[in-house]
């Protein structure tokens, strides 16, 4: 999944004006305001990586 | 395996300094924020510091702003909490935690995952 | 700084029973709520992040859910190692501030 331009979620990121551009391996992570290490998921029934979908079933990917 | 490990507490009087290490294993701390948390007896969780050693951001709690100071040592793959001006109400078991993040549409969605054994610091004359 | 405020602060419950925790926020902070289980004399451990995501292991027996300011930590059936203390943390904007705890225990 390539890198994607985000949405900060909180007018209180010290960047909240400046969307963050984050790598293939990273997210953005508003606690730090930075991007950050980001894994990937995979659903228990097919196995299939995937980004984290809001109101999906998932798991975290096991020993990654 | 990842593992978290503390080390450092112990018994100060008030107005001294400890330095709490947390030493990581199984990943690289540079990829990761890293926490300290805190737990007085009896008590619940509290929140104290956390660094994020690629960039060198931290960020305190108010409760110990300017006499705690967080670290890390990439090339030890180690975190550190250098603590002064130590009070009674400090005394408490100190935790360590990595804080996970997972890709949701770009944007970490995560807890602290892996936290260290904790390590007691007490504070008393 | 955002104050998570859980509910109840203790409760008392048997084994098989539905057990319901809440935790309100001072703002809004989106789904970015996690969920920990602690027991005497150990570390934390990770339940639910982003208000309802299942972490690694955790039985399926732990639910959670809400958004903006309201979350809900829901055990289906309680089971005896389920006795111990819950807190919500959320992670929205620093500082990451802790709820202040609910501690299950046996009715």
């Known amino acids: 999944m390539g890198a994607r331009r985000l949405r900060v979620r909180s007018q209180r990121s010290r960047d909240s004006s400046v969307p963050t551009q984050c790598n293939q391996t990273e997210c953005f992570d508003p606690l730090v305001r930075n991007c950050v290490s980001c894994e990937l998921f995979h659903t228990p029934d097919t196995g299939h990586t995937s980004s984290l979908e809001p109101g999906t079933a998932l798991q975290p990917q096991e020993g990654s | 395996e990842v593992q978290l490990v503390e080390s450092g507490g112990g018994l100060v009087q008030p107005g001294g300094s400890l330095r709490l290490s947390c030493a990581a294993s199984?990943?690289?701390?540079?990829?990761?924020?890293i926490h300290w948390v805190r737990q007085a007896p009896g008590k619940g969780l509290e929140w104290v510091a956390w660094v994020l050693p690629s960039v060198g951001f931290t960020d305190y709690a108010d409760s110990v702003k300017g006499r705690f100071t967080i670290s890390a040592d990439t090339s030890k793959n180690t975190a550190y909490l250098q603590m002064n001006s130590l009070r009674a109400e400090d005394t408490a078991v100190y935790y360590c935690?990595?804080?996970?993040?997972?890709?949701?549409?770009?944007?970490?969605?995560?807890?602290?995952?892996?936290w260290g054994q904790g390590t007691l610091v007490t504070v008393s004359s | 700084d955002i104050q998570m405020t859980q509910s109840p602060s203790s409760l008392s419950a048997s084994v098989g029973d539905r057990v319901t925790i809440t935790c309100r926020a001072s703002?809004?902070?989106?789904?970015?709520v996690a969920w920990y289980q602690q027991k005497p004399g150990k570390a934390p451990k990770l339940l639910i992040f982003a208000a309802s995501f299942l972490y690694s292991g955790v039985p399926s027996r732990f639910s959670g859910s809400g958004s903006g300011t309201d979350f809900t930590l829901t055990i289906s059936s309680l089971q005896p190692e389920d006795f111990a203390t819950y807190y919500c943390?959320?992670?929205?904007?620093?500082?990451?501030?802790f709820g202040q705890g609910t501690k299950v225990e046996i009715k």
């Open positions: 943390q959320q992670s929205e904007v620093s500082p990451p501030t």
């Open positions: 199984g990943f690289t701390i540079s990829s990761s924020s």
């Open positions: 703002e809004e902070i989106a789904t970015a």
């Open positions: 935690a990595r804080r996970v993040c997972y890709n949701r549409l770009g944007v970490c969605a995560g807890g602290m995952d892996y």
